[in-house]
């Protein structure tokens, strides 16, 4: 899994009439990092993982840095021709990696309310765009706004390329980044559904990386993908991840069913709990 | 222009609280953190804190953290800090400086501060 | 905190010279080292930057450089009206914190 730094800036308008503020939030290795708006950022998560590993760093040159981006992409927004009333947003999404090989990868992607409408290829500077009419319309306008400057662009995307991987090896040097694994709290609950139907929830928390299996097995079996119905992989806010999958089965039969984790190597099966006991938490280490 | 126009000299008394101030122009007020630094007769300079007028969040050097509160009044552009408990040791000339990512681009003409019985 | 030494305490020079002011951090700072120039009895006026940025209004004599924990302050050609203190000051780590400071002297 490659170390990655990801900035994700948003700009809004009015009436046509673009805001003053912006928000630009960054992630290392898919945690949510620093939080920027106006001349302030701040290191995110605060809990105690970025107490231990992020110190009492101000933060100056990526609060300078950041703020410019977020200028830049204000004026970018002002370049969109026929926008129409209330309120819209334009973002901006940079990511870089660094895979095991040392190999790089940068990206750069613009949406418009949402919807992704021009990408590039830091690195080769090849530019994409979906087929829709609007997204079309949107890049070219973009883009034209970008060209005008063509040497000031040229070098501003080099520049982001080059910065966001050297930003991304300061922080793997200094130790911001730390190659940990927490392994998952896990709970399997269930639930009273109707006709003689249970509904099993299995809930893993805590785990870091974000990378985990979690499945249903029918006497060892894993069930099919149609039957099981999975949340999303979600920070927690403590540097460590959230899950859960789930899958109705009928009442009686819970001793067939176990809920399978697998996490960094590791893996272990969880039983359904009998009807009298709500939870049954299990920790591996 | 920018300009930063602080309160005149004080003389307090040991234990008497004081309250200094840094009025705000030529600049938008609410969009940038405002500095305070303290200077001894004959010495350095030492950071004691910034605030950041559009919401009050402030930042304060521990050695100061029961010594001065930072405040402002956004509708005079207007800046304060309060000195609790004054000591001699507080006797020094105090700027407030207005902040550029971490650097005091523009400062006040200082205010002098003599604890004295 | 961060401390920040300043050598030598004080530098004098002759009109015309040229002088270089020196700042030591006590851990990795990056880039984030300002300078300031205080004349007797005013208040401090930023020279430069991060390192080696320069600041509108500021003569072109004066330039920055260093990265790290090393750090230099350059008047290319002093002239009499450089007589002042000049203290570094670093934004890395709270608390802000600033150098003891370098007296400037005319011989």
């Known amino acids: 899994e490659p170390h990655s730094l990801r900035y994700n800036l948003t700009v809004l308008s009015w009436d046509g009439s673009v805001q003053s503020g912006f928000l630009t939030e960054v992630h290392l290795d898919g945690q949510p990092f620093l939080r920027c708006d106006r001349q302030k950022c701040r290191a995110k998560p605060q809990g105690q993982w970025a107490e231990d590993v992020l110190g009492n760093k101000t933060w100056d040159r990526e609060t300078r840095d950041l703020t410019g981006n977020g200028k830049d992409l204000r004026m970018t927004l002002a370049h969109i021709k026929d926008q129409k009333e209330g309120l819209h947003s334009l973002q901006e999404i940079r990511v870089c990696e660094i895979h095991e090989d040392n190999s790089t990868r940068s990206s750069q992607h613009f949406y418009y309310d949402g919807e992704l409408f021009l990408s590039q290829n830091l690195e080769t500077k090849e530019w994409t765009m979906p087929q829709s009419s609007r997204a079309q319309t949107l890049a070219m306008n973009v883009r034209n706004f970008l060209k005008e400057d063509a040497m000031k662009t040229k070098t501003h995307y080099h520049a982001m390329h080059a910065d966001c991987l050297q930003e991304l090896r300061r922080y793997l040097k200094s130790g911001v980044v730390l190659r940990r694994t927490v392994p998952p709290m896990v709970n399997v609950t269930r639930s009273e559904a109707s006709e003689g139907n249970i509904t099993v929830t299995c809930r893993a928390s805590g785990f870091y990386p974000w990378n985990i299996t979690l499945s249903w097995r029918q006497d060892g079996v894993s069930l099919s993908h149609d039957t099981q119905q999975w949340g999303d992989v979600l920070p927690d806010g403590n540097g460590t991840y959230q899950t859960w999958v789930a899958t109705r089965i009928c009442q009686g039969e819970e001793q067939r069913f176990t809920c399978y984790m697998e996490h960094s190597g590791n893996h272990s099966t969880h039983p359904v709990p009998s009807g009298k006991v709500l939870v049954l938490q299990s920790h591996w280490q | 222009q920018v300009q930063l126009q602080q309160s005149g000299a004080d003389l307090v008394r040991p234990g008497a609280s004081v309250r200094l101030s840094c009025r705000a122009s030529?600049?938008?007020?609410?969009?940038?953190?405002m500095n305070w630094v303290k200077q001894r007769p004959g010495q350095g300079l030492e950071w004691i804190g910034m605030i950041h007028p559009s919401d009050s969040e402030t930042r304060l050097n521990q050695k100061f953290k029961d010594k001065a509160t930072l405040t402002v009044d956004k509708s005079s552009n207007t800046a304060y800090m309060q000195l609790s408990s004054p000591t001699s040791e507080d006797s020094a000339i105090y700027y407030c400086a207005r902040d550029d990512f971490f650097t005091m681009d523009y400062w006040g003409q200082g205010t002098s501060v003599t604890v004295s019985s | 905190d961060i401390l920040l030494t300043q050598s030598p305490a004080i530098l004098s020079v002759s009109p015309g010279e040229r002088v270089s002011f020196s700042c030591r951090a006590s851990?990795?700072?990056?880039?984030?080292i300002h300078w300031y120039q205080q004349s007797t009895n005013g208040s401090p006026r930023l020279l430069i930057k991060?390192?080696?940025e320069s600041i509108s209004g500021i003569p072109s004599r004066f330039s920055g450089s260093g990265s790290g924990t090393d750090f230099t302050l350059t008047i290319n050609s002093v002239e009499s009206e450089d007589v002042a203190d000049y203290y570094c000051q670093q934004s890395n780590i709270w608390p802000l914190t600033f150098g003891a400071g370098t007296k400037l002297e005319l011989k």
């Open positions: 851990q990795n700072i990056v880039t984030s």
């Open positions: 030529g600049y938008s007020f609410t969009n940038y953190w």
């Open positions: 991060y390192a080696s």
